[in-house]
Interface confidence: medium
Amino acid sequence: IAAHVISEASSKTTSVLQWAEKGYYTMSNNLVTLENGKQLTVKRQGLYYIYAQVTFCSNREASSQAPFIASLCLKSPGRFERILLRAANTHSSAKPCGQQSIHLGGVFELQPGASVFVNVTDPSQVSHGTGFTSFGLLKL
Amino acid sequence: IAAHVISEASSKTTSVLQWAEKGYYTMSNNLVTLENGKQLTVKRQGLYYIYAQVTFCSNREASSQAPFIASLCLKSPGRFERILLRAANTHSSAKPCGQQSIHLGGVFELQPGASVFVNVTDPSQVSHGTGFTSFGLLKL
Amino acid sequence: IAAHVISEASSKTTSVLQWAEKGYYTMSNNLVTLENGKQLTVKRQGLYYIYAQVTFCSNREASSQAPFIASLCLKSPGRFERILLRAANTHSSAKPCGQQSIHLGGVFELQPGASVFVNVTDPSQVSHGTGFTSFGLLKL
């Protein structure tokens, strides 16, 4: 069971990143699915290595004081959402904006029907050029 | 099937990074090989988790306006090269240069004879100290 | 065999990061253990994908000239310690400090009784908020 999906620019104002099965994507079988373009949902319980990469372009003067944060989150059936992993990068002083990349990855137990998704502080700063932003998992 | 190879400084002007089986490297068997010191080639079709880490030292004034970009690329038999993953980091204002590290990783389907390699915008900025820059894969 | 442990703030002055089985941690079985809150020790020989993520907050003026470096290290029975992976990030100019995240990961052969741990140049700069700093491995 494995998946790798590609970022998709979105007009939605939500902080949850959108993904698509496009380009050189992976969707090994129907035991993992991309739901509503926003979350990877697994049908089998087990240990999974889950990862995300986010490239963004921001400028210190044009952004809030807070850093750019990417969060890998989990929603299990009947449970509250929870943060699994986070990474933070302070905005660049480069103009008009400075690109930076964040990589998250870890091993987590998922229940049947569990979904994982990626949140960012400002989706408008995310880079969607080929290969820059992606999300995936593999079952151990 | 797994491999982990270590960066090698090169006098070549190519943007493709060079690697060696040295230090604490991994080459599990002959189903994966390091070819010409530049690409990992697999003999078996399947899903692979492929990763690269690149540490570099650059300065905004001494570099081009464009950020430092590391790209994980694929060459499959009978197909042309393509970008699988990329990461970008704006150059530092630190002098003489500021170090930064990039990590790339994802799950991809590889065909028999497929090769993966790593391209960077400026190989002269790459750090080759112990553990700083490496490249590998594992078959799921 | 898999583990994922969560960073723990420590009053110790050592450069070795401290970890705990807390939050959404993983410890698949007793073939991998967290020893003294500082190292993951494996009982079985084999190939392992080992990873660490460190988020830190630093300021160029308040820090040494040297960058922030995170190192993934190995101690095998009867052998000297060695560095497997390193990443470096120059300190931010943001005030009071600028957050940055480092991700390390690679495939390595471990012997029975081998331990892996994470060293940083300044543990006081490490961020211990939910999901920011973690450490783990999985056996291939």
């Epitope: 620019a9 496009k22 380009g23 050189y24 994507y25 880079s127 969607h128 050029g129 080929t130 290969g131 | 464009a66 970009i69 790209s71 197909r79 042309f80 393509r82 970008i83 990329r86 389907e109 915008t121 | -």
Partner: nanobody
Framework: EVQLLESGGGLVQPGGSLRLSCAAS????????MAWVRQAPGKGLEWVSS????????YYADSVKGRFTISRDNSKNTLYLQMNSLRAEDTAVYYC?????????WGQGTLVTVSS
């Protein structure tokens, strides 16, 4: 439906220049990596150059490095290949290509002949 239409080929003397264009339609051009490939008479397909979706990252085969320049105009959905210092061995049908996961789309091609 993905459509790629190449133009700009022709007969040119060694050392001369040509600019190839590729008009793309049927997909969101600005989101995709694009490439040029070529096929010389009696030979297989050879990758020439590729460019990322934003146009900031380019790659070239060693045989054309320093002579060819790939570029794109996302506002016009057009890919370009500027070919300078042409040689006899550059004679081929040049195809504009869009790589996909399991196959590659390419157009009908445009013939470039380098001869004195």
């Amino acid at each position: 439906e993905v459509q790629l239409l190449e133009s700009g080929g022709g007969l040119v003397q060694p050392g001369g220049s040509l600019r190839l264009s590729c008009a793309a339609s049927g997909f969101t051009f600005a989101l995709y990596q694009m490439a040029w490939v070529r096929q010389a008479p009696g030979k297989g397909l050879e990758w020439v150059s590729s460019i990322d979706s934003s146009g900031s990252d380019t790659y070239y085969a060693d045989s054309v490095k320093g002579r060819f320049t790939i570029s794109r105009d996302n506002s016009k959905n057009t890919l370009y290949l500027q070919m300078n210092s042409l040689r006899a061995e550059d004679t081929a049908v040049y195809y504009c290509a869009k790589p996909e996961r399991d196959f590659d789309y390419w157009g009908q091609g445009t013939l470039v002949t380098v001869s004195s």
